[in-house]
Structure formats: C-alpha cells, structure tokens
Interface confidence: low
Amino acid sequence: NECPELQPPVHGKIEPSQAKYFFKDQVLVSCDTGYKVLKDNVEMDTFQIECLKDGTWSNKIPTCKIVDCRAPGELEHGLITFSTRNNLTTYKSEIKYSCQEPYYKMLNNNTGIYTCSAQGVWMNKVLGRSLPTCLPECGQPSRSLPSLVKRIIGGRNAEPGLFPWQALIVVEDTSRVPNDKWFGSGALLSASWILTAAHVLRSQRRDTTVIPVSKEHVTVYLGLHDVRDKSGAVNSSAARVVLHPDFNIQNYNHDIALVQLQEPVPLGPHVMPVCLPRLEPEGPAPHMLGLVAGWGISNPNVTVDEIISSGTRTLSDVLQYVKLPVVPHAECKTSYESRSGNYSVTENMFCAGYYEGGKDTCLGDSGGAFVIFDDLSQRWVVQGLVSWGGPEECGSKQVYGVYTKVSNYVDWVWEQMGLPQSVVEPQVER
C-alpha cells in the first residue's frame, strides 16, 4: 500500500524525505525561515500528513506563505517610511521610524530601523518589538536668539518664536468679590508641563498659609507674542497645580511650581520646551549672561502702588526680553542685608542684574525663565525663575532681581512629571 510521491511546497520541505512511503508513514511539512504553513487559510508552523491504508495521503500538501508583519504601529509625534519598494511589510522588509523634527527627537538616538522578523513582528536591534519614543526637543528656538544684546525694564521687543517656551499664566478667581485676577509667566518643559514660581500660583490670602489656586482658575497661553492678539496662541486649562511643598511665603524660599496642562500642546516654531539643567548645587556661575522674557512692566517709572491699583493694564503688549548677568551670591546677599526689611537670599536662589540698574525683571514677569545658553549641548537651559526683588522700583541701582535656582529642584521636577531623570538629562550634559 504505497502512497504517491510527495513534492515539497515552494519555500518548504517535507521530513523525512524518502523515495517511497507506505501505510502508516507520517511526514511533517514545514516552511523556510520567514514563511508559514498555510492550510485552509489557517497559518501554522508545521503540518502533519499520513499515508493511509488505501494508498492515499490523509491531506493535500499545504502551501508556504511569506510572513507578513502587517502595518507597523503608529508612533506618537513620529513618521514611518518604508525602505522596501511598494511599501512591503513581509519578511525582511524594512521600515524607518523618525520623529517630527525639529520639534521632537528620538530617545537614545535610536536608528528607528525595524525589520520584519520571521515571527511576523517588527523588530529593532536595540528596542526589540517596542516602539521608539519621540521626546520634545528642548532649548532650540526656531529663530536663533541674538548672541549680543546691548547692555521687562530696559528690555526690548522679542520677535515671535524667540522664546518658544514662554507661557503667560492668567489666574482668575471668580469666587471672590471683587474678582481676583493676576498673571505671571512660566516656561514649557514638555508638551504637558509648565514650570513657574510658586508665588504665582499661591492662593492670595492674608495669612501665610500656602494653598495653591484652584486649577479651574488657571489659564495658560503658549505661542503668545502680543497680548492684544491671542488668536495665534494655544490656550490650555490646568489639570494639576503643584507647588513645592516647602515654599515659604515669608522669604520666598523654594519658589517653584508646576502646572500640568489639561491636554498636551502641539509643538511648533512658536511652542517648544526649554531644557532643564542638570542637578547642580552651584547653579549658574557668577557673571554668566542669561535672558529673561516677560510681559511685565517695562516702564521704569511705574511705582509699585500704580501697578497694584491698575491691575493687568500695566502688561507690556509685546513680549519683552532683557539680558542680565548672574551676580555673585555674596554680593547679592550683602546688597539685601544692607537694606531695612527681612530679606533672605538663600542657597535656593541666585541674583542677576546690573549694579547701576536700568535693566531688570519686574512685577508680572514672575515665574518666567532665566535662560542660559549651554555651549556644549547648544541649547537654552532654564537656570532661574523670576522670584522677587527689593522694595525700590524695578531696575533701581544695586537692586538685583532674585531668581529661584532651578538646578536645586531638577529631581523634584522630574518626580512630579513622572519621568525618569535619565530620559532627558543627557541633552544638557556638560
């Protein structure tokens, strides 16, 4: 009872391979690497048939079908290009993931190349079957910041896109009579998080308790240039308001806070994050020049009383910026200790400004980023947040602006944002 000779399928083989097959002989049909056995539209690894008593085979020889990885997974903020003609997705085909440059960059400089494996999954040499991650690029404005601004008060108009991380934070507490409304600045750290000063987001109370404003009362504007025209800006409500738990309203120590946006904002030429510094106790070195932008008062003759009485009318229409040097800590401490009043320049603060005055940050600039260009990474890094200043008018002689030293809080910021520090930290390694 001999069964007919068997022909192995194309791209396959039969085992054992014999000249003759008799009753009860069994053969296993399998396919070459990258092919699957296909029988009655069902894919399988192997298929067994048997020589029957009547000299026929128990089943027809199946076919071998090339493995198909199918359409690759979508990558958030990324693109896919097919390296193989006709956009093939079969065994050994290649695809390349890339991020939406220049706003996003692939984590760990991955190649983004995936190959369709014999198992039918897209595989990357480093990540395996996991998709790459596109992270927002930071500290690289689409318009390059001027390297020399001749020696906000004494500032100048910023061109659109010059400070793409700049956020306007408007706080409006409608539950109060009369309505409470104030504003400050902030800096975009990722598509979902804004860094600012805690005093901007503290509920305005007569006592010294530190309670954040209700998230419902916070609106954040990004990509804003002229406050009279908010049409081109992205506005977002807050999902969370996080004040540093140690913020001290009496001396403004730990004056740092975060706002998580309700929805991630789309990045573009006018909306891009700034880089966080490395965790460094020293902060920016004395005499280093930094830039600060804001819509705060730009008229040096406006008194604090006028500011308070006129509410938000003292906003500059167009975003202003100023270039200021970091002041040696001892010099700043001395300048404040010599004043009447209980001024405390702590290790969590640094000062910036000119001895002769004339250029400074002012009310309404609060929470804005003091950025320094990092030569090694060629990126702008947020080293300070506009925090407080002396009792005299902004820009007065020997009244330095005091800034929160962001490098002391990098770990706290990462912890709040829920990102591992290693994810973005190499971007600003020195």
């Epitope: 530190v210 540093h244 738990p245 140690d246 001290n248 009496q250 730990h254 965790l279 460094e280 106790p281 020293e282 290790e347 969590n348 002391n408 809080y409 990098v410 770990d411 706290w412 912890e415």
Partner: antibody, heavy 120, light 109 residues
C-alpha cells in the same frame, strides 16, 4: 540603589583621634552632600555637618567645629569623619546619611552607623 | 538653635490602636519637619517630610500634620512592627544646625 557603607566599630583612648568612613554607591557621588549625625547611647540625634563632593564645601554645626573634620576621597566615593581630642562624651554611634532631594534637608538614606567607644 | 521638644519619652499602645506622637518647635519652622522611625541597633528610617508628605514605601497608616510650631505623627491601626522610637527633625534653620527631637518610644501596654 543608593547605599552608604560605614566602617567598623572603633575602640579608642581619650585624647586620641578617630577617622571613620562612609562609602557611597548607587548614584552620582558629586550630586549630593553626605551628612553626619551623632547618636549617644539611648539618646537623640545631633547633626554634625555635611560635606559636598561637588565642590568640597563643608558645613558644620557650631557645636562640632574643632571637634569634627570632614574630608573626601573622590576616587572611591568615600567621605571621612575625623574626630579629634576624644573624650567619653564622644562615645556614640555616628551615622552618615544622604538627602533624597537636594533641596530638602531631611535624610532618606542612612549608613548602618559606626560605634565609637572612648575608654582608657 | 531651634529646640524640638517631644514631651512624651514613652507611649504605651496596643496593636490596632491609633496613636499621636507630638513634637513642638521652639520657634516657627513652617512645614520644614521630618519624622523618623528607629528600631534598636538600626539606623533611622524616614517616614514623613515637609510635615505631611509620606516618604515612598511608607505605609499609609503613618500620617503627619502641623505647621509653625506644633507637629503630630499619627499612626492609625498600630502594628507590632511599629513598636520603635520616633524622632522629629526640623530643617528650617539649615545651614545652621538641623535639630532633632529627643525621641518618643512606642511600647506595648
């Protein structure tokens, strides 16, 4: 994970000095100061001071100035506490510790402690 | 230096009880207070920082409260492993001396 390994117990005579070590691992050594605490038998804790490997900055509690000296050996990620002119009052367990966050001055990571006994 | 006073040197409790360990600062320290647990022969373990923030891995039966000068560590549903000494610490005065309370020993009734 963050680990602080301290040197073993010391039995020293009055008037002598003792130098104990705290070897850090599991993090970038230069990022955080190493703090030192003293705990007398059955008593509370006292902060001696700290040493910051980033810039070799030392801060001392006034009470321990002249008694304690903090030094570092960066190649081995080790900070040393040396106590001089020992008296029986210096008999205690000495702990090294590290902050969890740079800007919060409380301590989440501790060494197991070094027992110093001053006895003639 | 700021003095942290833990008026009760010993406190007796039973498993399942709720206990309040108190600490008083000699001057306003805001919320710059941490609590530690220490068992014999061991190093202290951080429980609470910034007066009310639980350190990671600490069971939620431990809660901290207070600001200014008066602080409380509450242990609800005391377990046998909670029998230990508890210290408060203020860090408002850094870099001048950080100071600890004298400790409160939690014992079984």
């Amino acid at each position: 994970q963050v680990q602080l390994k301290q040197s073993g117990a010391e039995l020293v005579t009055p008037g002598a000095s003792v130098k104990m070590s705290c070897k850090a691992s599991g993090y970038t050594f230069t990022t955080y100061p190493i703090e030192w605490m003293k705990q007398n038998h059955g008593k509370s804790l006292e902060w001696i001071g700290n040493f910051h490997p980033y810039n070799d900055d030392t801060k001392y509690n006034e009470k321990f100035k002249g008694k304690a000296t903090l030094t570092v050996e960066k190649s081995s990620n080790t900070v040393y506490l040396e106590l001089s002119r020992l008296t029986s009052d210096d008999s205690a367990v000495y702990f090294c510790a590290r902050r969890v966050y740079y800007s919060y001055f409380w301590f989440g990571y501790w060494g197991h402690g070094t027992l110093v006994t001053v006895s003639s | 230096d700021i003095v942290m006073t833990q008026s009760q040197k010993f406190m007796s409790t039973s498993v399942g009880d709720r206990v309040n360990v108190t600490c008083k600062a000699s001057q306003n320290v805001g919320t710059h207070v941490a609590w530690y647990q220490q068992k014999p022969g061991q190093s202290p373990k951080a429980l609470i920082y910034s007066a009310s923030y639980r350190y990671s891995g600490v069971p939620d039966r431990f809660t901290g409260s207070g600001s200014g000068t008066d602080f409380t560590l509450t242990i609800s549903n005391v377990q046998s492993e909670d029998l230990a000494e508890y210290f408060c610490q203020q860090y408002n005065s850094y870099p001048r001396a950080l100071t600890f309370g004298a400790g409160t020993k939690l014992e079984l009734k």
